[in-house]
Interface confidence: low
Amino acid sequence: LVITPPGPELILNVSSTFVLTCSGSAPVVWERMSQELPQEMAKAQDNTFSSVLTLTNLTGLDTGEYFCTYNDSRGLEPDERKRLYIFVPDPTVGFLPNDAEELFIFLTEITEITIPCRVTDPQLVVTLHEKKGDIALPVPYDHQRGFSGIFEDRSYICKTTIGDREVDSDAYYVYRLQVSSINVSVNAVQTVVRQGENITLMCIVIGNEVVNFEWMYPRKESGRLVEPVTDFLLDMPYHIRSILHIPSAELEDSGTYTCNVTESVNDHQDEKAINITVVESGYVRLLGEVGALQFAELHRSRTLQVVFEAYPPPTVLWFKDNRTLGDSSAGEIALSTRNVSETRYVSELTLVRVKVAEAGHYTMRAFHEDAEVQLSFQLQINVPVRVLELSESHPDSGEQTVRCRGRGMPQPNIIWSACRDLKRCPRELPPMLLGNSSEEESQLETNVTYWEEEQEFEVVSTLRLQHVDRPLSVRCTLRNAVGQDMQEVIVVPHSLPFK
């Protein structure tokens, strides 16, 4: 870009006419205060573009910045924009007029600012004063911009002398604002409501004095506006709140509610959204699953948990074998339903030191006036195995038998093992397993009975040993899902007189 004359600063006479030319490799345009000026644009044969700006009947108000830039200057580099400053000394114009917002300078931190009092003549001496004082402040002055420095929260004026008269500028007010990066929070009294209930949302900004709230909500899209209320939370410094209240919600009010907050000083903005659901009627819905068969271990505590979503808050009941359960005074059963989020609940049944009698069919029922859900499962009490009896006998047939009896829930497995070398058994040599060999040395017979009243299995296993020629250590091991137990007996050959 080439400007003629090149500037960067020109001093022109009042009432004169002046021509400025700008040329470049693409269409160019003259601008002042972000506005295009009336100008003549042309394209030369050598594919250069130019724009001629004719300033006529100049006055002091023509003092200021002029820019030449490419016509489509979006995204162009800074050096693809040329600046020119023109002074038109005019004794009838004191200080150049300011827009109202230029008279109020808002500070958000201790930083250098400019008080933009400008004159038409670069030769004039300009001084800065506090509004209520005569002493000139030691602040540097730039005729094109004004006074730049670090200023306190005060009122300031600029002074100059034109001819023999003293001229004062308008007063400039410097305010230091409480402004932080915007931190918006949005919450609702309820995010789920039924038709006809109220929707109330609050948008809170902390740490800012000057903010603007804008709400977006489903009703607004259909042109039905709701007037929010903005207030200050007086007990907290710089807490500003906007409340959006929609009485008697409709299904169409479901959707996203967004609070957009802008702070005009630093142009910061933040927005937060919240989803509101308006339901035709209330609901109860299970989340996740609970298996149809649950287990608890005898004499241990067991907590059974059901997670569900519901609105409005439901009543929760637990039943065992169709009998309503309640917290027992003996502390054997504890019931609790916790509201873990607005519409999410966790209901827990805790059985303390579980007893066999607590096995059975359990049901949780959650309900309110609109809906209900129920979940059922069977509770099985697991009992660790116990070996109740291990005995050895010598029937007349000549064989020797070892009988092992034990109980547990679920059904125990039985494992027989034996050691011939008593000195090294059972630590060093693995015992040989019995009862599953095809040899005729041993035979096994096992019977299982389920005892309904005790809700456990009894296993009776008889091991028949054919040829015992030296002492034999026989072990019976019972195992189930929750434990194992064992006993040993020494079987002595018939021929030996002792046991």
């Epitope: 309110h368 609109d370 209900e372």
Partner: antibody, heavy 121, light 113 residues
Framework: QLQLQESGPGLVKPSETLSLTCIVS??????????WGWIRQPPGKGLEWIGS???????FYNPSLKSRVTISVDTSKNQFSLTLTSVTAADTAVFYC?????????????WGQGTLVTVSS | DIVMTQSPESLAVSLGERATINCKSS????????????LAWYQLKPGQPPNLLIY???TRESGVPDRFSGSGSGTDFTLTIGSLQAEDVAVYYC?????????FGPGTKVDIK
């Protein structure tokens, strides 16, 4: 207008993993009013519900498939996905994604067009 | 799981005649607290996704012709097509949404006689 569109490979080898995506347009998957589900229909057979998902990540599955199924959501892309592991020829089916309301319970009111997945070597 | 059964497996009806499909659930899908039956009916045409016709056992989905109606309560339900049209040729499924897993009936094929 709400539209659901399933996408994924039409052919998967036995024992491999089947992955499908359902893209939701004309509405937000983050709506707190809906669940998003998968249903399948093997050739010549009836419909079978696989599982459903809430945008926050809550899932519930058909117990018959639970050990092999994962349903997940990507709210930034407005889509949700189905993964079915260790597939066999019995998993050959048209897979549909669908929407149902978050109420006490509700039917599937919007369905995708469906995509045929064949399990074969 | 709640098992849904349908009868008949297929039926052929003359144009303009009434078609009736039955659906039975293995347990009641009526919630006593709101007196609603958690049953839906869908229409499935080849190459198209299922289309919801009826929910709450008897409420017609918007846009569904009024020749389609649903009835029944508890465990026994019926879908009736009052006057069969050519475009009604399809397979019809009932579905319970009373509890998970949601289950569908095996379907009933409707043709023109």
């Amino acid at each position: 207008q709400l539209q659901l569109q399933e996408s994924g490979p039409g052919l998967v080898k036995p024992s491999e993993t089947l992955s499908l995506t359902c893209i939701v347009s004309g509405g937000s998957i983050s709506s707190s009013s809906y669940y998003w589900g998968w249903i399948r229909q093997p050739p010549g057979k009836g419909l079978e519900w696989i599982g459903s998902l809430y945008y926050s990540g809550i899932t519930f599955y058909n117990p018959s498939l639970k050990s092999r199924v994962t349903i997940s959501v990507d709210t930034s892309k407005n889509q949700f996905s189905l993964t079915l592991t260790s597939v066999t020829a019995a998993d050959t089916a048209v897979f549909y994604c669908a929407r149902h309301r978050v109420m006490a319970s509700s039917p599937f009111d919007h369905w995708g067009q469906g995509t045929l997945v064949t399990v074969s070597s | 799981d709640i098992v849904m059964t349908q009868s008949p497996e297929s039926l052929a009806v003359s144009l303009g005649e009434r078609a009736t499909i039955n659906c039975k659930s293995s347990q009641s899908i009526l919630y006593s607290s709101n007196n609603k039956n958690y049953l839906a009916w869908y229409q499935l045409k080849p190459g198209q996704p299922p289309n919801l016709l009826i929910y709450w056992a008897s409420t017609r989905e918007s846009g569904v012709p009024d020749r389609f109606s649903g009835s029944g309560s508890g465990t026994d339900f019926t879908l009736t097509i009052g006057s069969l049209q050519a475009e009604d040729v399809a397979v019809y499924y009932c579905q319970q949404y009373y509890s998970t897993p949601f289950t569908f009936g095996p379907g009933t094929k409707v043709d023109i006689k």
